[in-house]
Amino acid sequence: GIAIPRNSGCPNSEDKNFPRTVMVNLNIHNRNTSTNPKRSSDYYNRSTSPWNLHRNEDPERYPSVIWEAKCRHLGCVKADGNVDYHMNSVPIQQEILVLRREPRHCPNSFRLEKILVSVGCTCVTPIVHHVA
Amino acid sequence: GIAIPRNSGCPNSEDKNFPRTVMVNLNIHNRNTSTNPKRSSDYYNRSTSPWNLHRNEDPERYPSVIWEAKCRHLGCVKADGNVDYHMNSVPIQQEILVLRREPRHCPNSFRLEKILVSVGCTCVTPIVHHVA
């Protein structure tokens, strides 16, 4: 973690586990009030590298539901709807933080976990031609 | 949260803030050992909807550094390198969880926060509105 001077108003941290274990308020603050999250909801269908969304559920994780993108095609889709063999559909992956119940089934104790999720797909050229 | 019967081995939750406040172990467990996260690192350059990555830093947040994708073009890049304005480069966005220090500057007290980040870009067919 980042070393930040502690305010006198901070919760007490005299704990043998500190700074490994911290208190987290689960009342989620959503910063996206001005953004409509459905904005990109149809891109998965309109993309030249379209994808399907698969539900990944795990009650031992917070959030328990994560949506995983799977590219529909190996190639990209041309204007006429047919495959372009010269281009590839690939997943765009991102590492995200989730909370994992630890010990298992405990409602108020978690461990931070990094997982790699596929968010959507993009169309790429398979070979980069290096010019001497 | 999900109502899960508490194990006898769980940390005590007799706290007036529970279930709003939980204990989180910040020793991150990384589930991506078998996946090489560099696999998709050059897609941003090879995509028909290429993007730049901008560093967003906030010491009051965990993780403090988040990379935001910004599409380079409004249109998509054709095989000859020129931009096709009949297609659109659009950001693929995802809501992610971060930890926000609360109260500010406190090293061991956080609130869960949802933020919307752009992970990469994809090339889509624009929506054509037909006038009756």
């Epitope: 095609h73 190996l74 190639g75 041309k78 006429d80 709807g81 047919n82 495959v83 372009d84 063999y85 010269h86 590839n88 690939v90 398979p126 070979i127 | 696999r39």
Partner: antibody
């Protein structure tokens, strides 16, 4: 049971033409990508042509481009390979193969092959 | 074109042995690799796609893995019926290309 049966191979003189066919059964032909792959006498495998499920996309490697044409008749569950300006290096066993998806990237079912010999 | 190199054209192994067949791609192919088995007089048979996904009906003693541009096909506890030639194929960049094959003989 998926079956692919090739026919049309034979002995042809250099510069000649020949048409190979592959009849498919046991699956919905019109929803699968198909390919022709050949195996040379030294047992090397080489892609010859790809065609997607509806015939809207095709691909040929440089070695056969302009000389070979792949087509399909979904109503008759048949894949074709029209070959012209044949060369001795086209001598091979020709297999038709199915992709498990729409397009033709890798091959989960192969026919037993038909032999083409180009020789004077 | 992407070159697929199977460095061992053939080798002889004993029943029950563990065998590793390797295939090296000249460029990154991002796991778009298939493995085939071919027995004399027969057409190739798909074993693995996506570098690691075992096809339905293929015995679990076959497995695939990747390290960078190097791909491997492992056969655990070799059986008599595994005597064959094994080919890799990339499907990342057209034209799809095959390795030269590795012939497995039982001692």
């Amino acid at each position: 049971e998926v079956q692919l049966v090739e026919s049309g191979g034979g002995l042809v003189q250099p510069g000649g033409s020949l048409k190979l066919s592959c009849v498919a059964s046991g699956f919905t032909f019109s929803t699968y990508g198909m390919s022709w792959v050949r195996q040379t006498p030294d047992k090397r495998l080489e892609l010859v042509a790809i065609i997607n499920h509806n015939g809207g996309s095709t691909f040929y490697p440089d070695s056969v481009k302009g000389r070979f044409t792949v087509s399909r008749d979904n109503a008759k569950n048949t894949l074709h390979l029209q070959m012209s300006s044949l060369k001795s290096e086209d001598t091979a066993m020709y297999y038709c193969a199915r992709d498990p998806r729409h397009d033709g990237y890798f091959f989960d079912y192969w026919g037993q092959g038909t032999t083409l010999t180009v020789s004077s | 074109d992407i070159q697929m190199t199977q460095s061992s054209p053939s080798f002889s192994v004993s029943l029950g042995d563990r065998v590793t067949i390797t295939c090296k791609a000249s460029e990154d192919i991002y796991d778009r690799l298939a493995w085939y088995q071919q027995k004399p007089g027969n057409a190739p048979r798909l074993l693995i796609s996506g570098a690691t996904s075992l096809e339905t009906g293929i015995p679990s003693r076959f497995s695939g893995s990747r390290s960078g541009k190097d791909y491997t096909l492992d056969i655990n506890s070799l059986q008599t019926e595994d005597a064959a030639t094994y080919y890799c194929q990339q499907y990342w960049s057209v034209p799809w290309t095959f390795g030269g094959g590795t012939k497995l003989e039982i001692k």
